[in-house]
């Protein structure tokens, strides 16, 4: 269950991004295919849509930032990407405060898809408590809702 | 080493569900992508679905209203169930591995003949 | 899906001569300059077995005779020197997109 107890640091700004190595017989980094990326969509789609829940669960009331625009998807290129490098600071920001388990998973799945040097920049959330909950709601839902699209491109046509 | 085992029955009835085995040894299945690929008598060979480390599953379009993909992590085993089956569905059916990203299959089973006939 | 053509469907070649197997796939089956194209060995009453990778990566264990090459759309295996234990059918697959696909098999014979 996710719960804040008080300021964190947390990533929004969003850099193009793709894969990282994990052997030496995996494609080199940012050079997976169609098929890998979805296939990593796949395995986020259940984990981002069990925390989204969890959340909205235990923090019932809390509204959607107006505010806050998680700008998830590169324009650069076709099919649509998910960008990474923004995303991947705030669930280790979060790691601490949340499930771990779930958190570390959606971590590992981010790395793959994160330009090997792509440097990762920080932003505060808001020092309000209930700000801050509106905060981490408004990205858990843009977050499922990008890897909704993305799916969505990589499923429809060639690539 | 990685080893890959197939098995279930050779002869299935039309319209009956066609359902195998795979065992695994020398790896686990809780890592990589597990699948099943057949070989027609023509030997054109076509790409099933898999079953992902997290037990995600993901099928061929062609397949997808009759095929199922599940796994007993217990006993480093997955299976494949094909309902509804016709005599096209005659084939050998492999399992194999797909280990890393950007990979390709690396690990093979030998293969378990199936025929479709009443 | 990506339609993948091999050709010659069969070839004979003497011991010790080159063979040559194309694969062409019907839209490019690359990304940031890889190709996600590899190819199998099949010997009678055996399973697929790995002997190229990402077009042109030799898998552990494969005799350096075999050679992949190619990218986007057209890809070659080369056997050389061909050996009597390479009877056997090669197939292209690509893992560009899903559903993954395979060409339709070159039967690899020794004259």
């Known amino acids: 269950m996710l719960s804040h107890t008080g300021p964190s640091r947390f990533a929004l700004f969003l850099l193009c991004s793709m894969e990282t190595l994990l052997s030496s017989h995996m494609a080199p980094t940012h050079q997976l295919p169609p098929s890998d990326v979805r296939k990593i969509i796949l395995e986020l789609q259940p984990l981002s849509r069990g925390l989204l829940e969890d959340y909205q669960k235990k923090e019932t009331g809390v509204p959607e930032s107006n505010r806050t625009l998680l700008l998830c998807l590169t324009s650069d290129s076709q099919p649509p990407r998910l960008n990474s490098s923004a995303i991947l600071p705030y669930f280790r920001a979060i790691r601490p405060l949340s499930d771990k388990n779930i958190i570390d998973k959606i971590i590992e799945q981010l790395d793959k898809l994160k330009f090997q040097h792509e440097p990762e920049t920080e932003i505060s959330v808001p020092a309000d408590t209930f700000e801050c909950k509106s905060f981490i709601l408004t990205i858990l839902q843009q977050f499922s809702a990008c890897l909704e699209s993305v799916f969505k491109s990589l499923n429809s046509g060639p690539q | 080493e990685v080893q890959l085992q197939e098995s279930g029955p050779s002869l299935v009835k039309p319209s009956q569900t066609l359902s195998l085995t795979c065992s695994v040894t020398?790896?686990?299945?809780?890592?990589?992508?597990w699948n099943w690929i057949r070989k027609f008598p023509g030997n054109k060979l076509e790409y099933m679905g898999y079953?992902?480390?997290?037990?995600?599953?993901d099928y061929n379009p062609s397949l997808k209203s009759r095929i199922s993909i599940t796994r007993d992590t217990s006993k480093n085993q997955y299976y494949l169930q094909l309902n509804s089956v016709t005599t096209e569905d005659t084939a050998t059916y492999y399992c194999?591995?797909?280990?890393?990203?950007?990979?390709?299959?690396?690990?093979w089973g030998q293969g378990t003949s199936v025929t479709v006939s009443s | 899906d990506i339609v993948l053509t091999q050709s010659p469907a069969s070839l004979a070649v003497s011991l010790g001569q080159r063979a040559t197997i194309s694969c062409r796939a019907s839209?490019?089956?690359?990304?940031?300059?890889?190709?996600?194209m590899h190819w199998y060995q099949q010997k009678s009453g055996q399973s697929p077995k790995l002997l190229i990778y990402?077009?042109?990566n030799l898998e552990s264990g494969i005799p350096a005779r075999f050679g992949g090459s190619g990218s986007r759309t057209d890809f070659t295996l080369t056997i050389d020197p061909v050996e009597a234990d390479d009877v056997a059918t090669y197939y292209c697959?690509?893992?560009?997109?899903?559903?993954?696909?395979f060409g339709g098999g070159t039967k690899l014979e020794i004259k």
């Open positions: 194999a591995r797909y280990g890393n990203y950007g990979y390709a299959m690396d690990y």
């Open positions: 020398g790896d686990s299945i809780t890592s990589g992508y």
């Open positions: 079953i992902s480390y997290s037990g995600i599953t």
């Open positions: 839209e490019s089956v690359d990304t940031y300059g890889n190709s996600f």
């Open positions: 990402r077009a042109s």
């Open positions: 697959q690509q893992s560009y997109e899903d559903p993954w696909t």
